[in-house]
Interface confidence: low
Amino acid sequence: EVEKTACPSGKKAREIDESLIFYKKWELEACVDAALLATQMDRVNAIPFTYEQLDVLKHKLDELYPQGYPESVIQHLGYLFLKMSPEDIRKWNVTSLETLKALLEVNKGHEMSPQVATLIDRFVKGRGQLDKDTLDTLTAFYPGYLCSLSPEELSSVPPSSIWAVRPQDLDTCDPRQLDVLYPKARLAFQNMNGSEYFVKIQSFLGGAPTEDLKALSQQNVSMDLATFMKLRTDAVLPLTVAEVQKLLGPHVEGLKAEERHRPVRDWILRQRQDDLDTLGLGLQGGIPNGYLVLDLSMQEALS
């Protein structure tokens, strides 16, 4: 705790300027008026204060605004934002996208800190949903942001926001997240024509059901192996050899290199060997010719 000491004669700050960097911590406490600091927060960022001095400035703002800082101050916090705790940030009411951008800029290039995560949470909750402009901003600063959300949180993303999502934003999403995002993407892109639709939906296909994969196989989409390998195992298993051949087009030859990696390995185990042989790729591990094939989809439904 900085002791309350009287400001030395002639040292009372009339404005926030570079002369303050020569003030000792106790002098800043005694000589800088909190209300002045609040109105001139935009200047703080341009002055090379030490971390200890920034602690004092934060302390003064905390005293002035015990219930949380107003947005006019928050927007100009600059590097002082790095001094805030998640508990401080939970008291804020941030509604302006410009404020959010200004604070994210401070943390740019670093991983998402607990402070930033709390800020984003407060902002999104305040808006009620993850709208397109917000999603645009967040994924620009943190490409993995979308995949850090729970399926429940993703459910509040409106389909219109999906237009802001880039393929790299989905790199770290797991099947549960793609299960939520895929139907939204399907809705968002429904009016696009075949080839354009596939380009847009491709990144979301890890959440696609079997029926949609079957439909895509009829559209000459030539899915690449990287996309195929990210499909749900249970969505791939019911596909026939002919459907997979149509789905992959010229990329079907890549199955050989992936024949023992999921989901290809499990799909192979479910196919008749003579059907696999028609691909001419030398895929092994199918059901030997002459064996009785149970209805595996029925078996899965029962289990």
Epitope: P151, H261, Q284, S303
Partner: antibody
Framework: QVQLQESGGGLVKPSETLSLTCTVS??????????WSWIRQHPGKCLEWIGY???????YTNPSLRDRLKISVDTSKNQFSLKLSSVTAADTAMYYC???????????WGQGTMVTVSS | QSALTQPASVSGSPGQSITISCTGT?????????VSWYQQHPGKAPKLMIY???NRPSGVSNRFSGSKSGNTASLTISGLQAEDEADYYC??????????FGCGTKLTVL
């Protein structure tokens, strides 16, 4: 009747490389549809999946071990092997080789070989 | 990937039925029908008892059955016998294409 037998267990010094081999008898390692796997059982009884190899040489391994792990196959000897580098005491375990078929289930297991990491 | 959660021990008298639970998440047990169960007697290797949630390999007694609800799989042993006393482990395929096991349940036949 396919049988699996591990070899190479014993005492390994910290930071050294652990090397184990599993010999398959009673069947060919090259028969399609099976994935030749390694699993370990820590002293506290917990089982941990290490990874598998197919006769073609394709592997898939536990991400937590991937940087230190190499699984290889020698179809001419009907064997597959595991090498785990930079071992620590946390790698002390009973190591099993097993055959994995449909449904990600291990239907045949070796008897296991104990590996102790200690200086 | 965290280990699946199993009770440390269960017990039952001969002739009774017991159930062992195995709890995971929607990324493993809840997301796929690829749950297996293994029996392990002291000093022995594990033995497959159930695969794909409820299927029994040939040679395994029909007293052993498996089921799943949500993120929890269960192994039920009916008509408990002395030779059933062992450790039982569950395993599941996961969304990261790996396999995860439980840490085992010790079954005591009283």
């Amino acid at each position: 009747q396919v049988q699996l037998q591990e070899s190479g267990g014993g005492l390994v010094k910290p930071s050294e490389t652990l090397s184990l081999t599993c010999t398959v008898s009673g069947g060919s390692i090259s028969s399609g549809g099976y994935f030749w796997s390694w699993i370990r059982q820590h002293p506290g009884k917990c089982l941990e999946w290490i990874g598998y190899i197919y006769y073609s040489g394709s592997t898939y391994t536990n991400p937590s071990l991937r940087d230190r792990l190499k699984i290889s196959v020698d179809t001419s000897k009907n064997q597959f092997s595991l090498k785990l580098s930079s071992v620590t005491a946390a790698d002390t375990a009973m190591y099993y080789c097993a055959r994995e078929g449909a449904g990600y289930a291990f239907d045949i297991w070796g008897q296991g070989t104990m590996v102790t990491v200690s200086s | 990937q965290s280990a699946l959660t199993q009770p440390a021990s269960v017990s039952g008298s001969p002739g009774q039925s017991i159930t062992i639970s195995c709890t995971g998440t929607s990324s493993d047990v809840g997301g796929y029908n690829y749950v297996s169960w293994y029996q392990q007697h002291p000093g022995k290797a594990p033995k497959l008892m159930i695969y794909e949630v409820s299927n029994r390999p040939s040679g395994v007694s029909n007293r052993f059955s498996g089921s799943k609800s949500g993120n929890t799989a269960s192994l039920t042993i009916s008509g408990l016998q002395a030779e059933d006393e062992a450790d039982y482990y569950c395993s599941s395929y996961t969304s990261s294409s790996t396999l995860v096991f439980g840490c085992g349940t010790k079954l005591t036949v009283l």
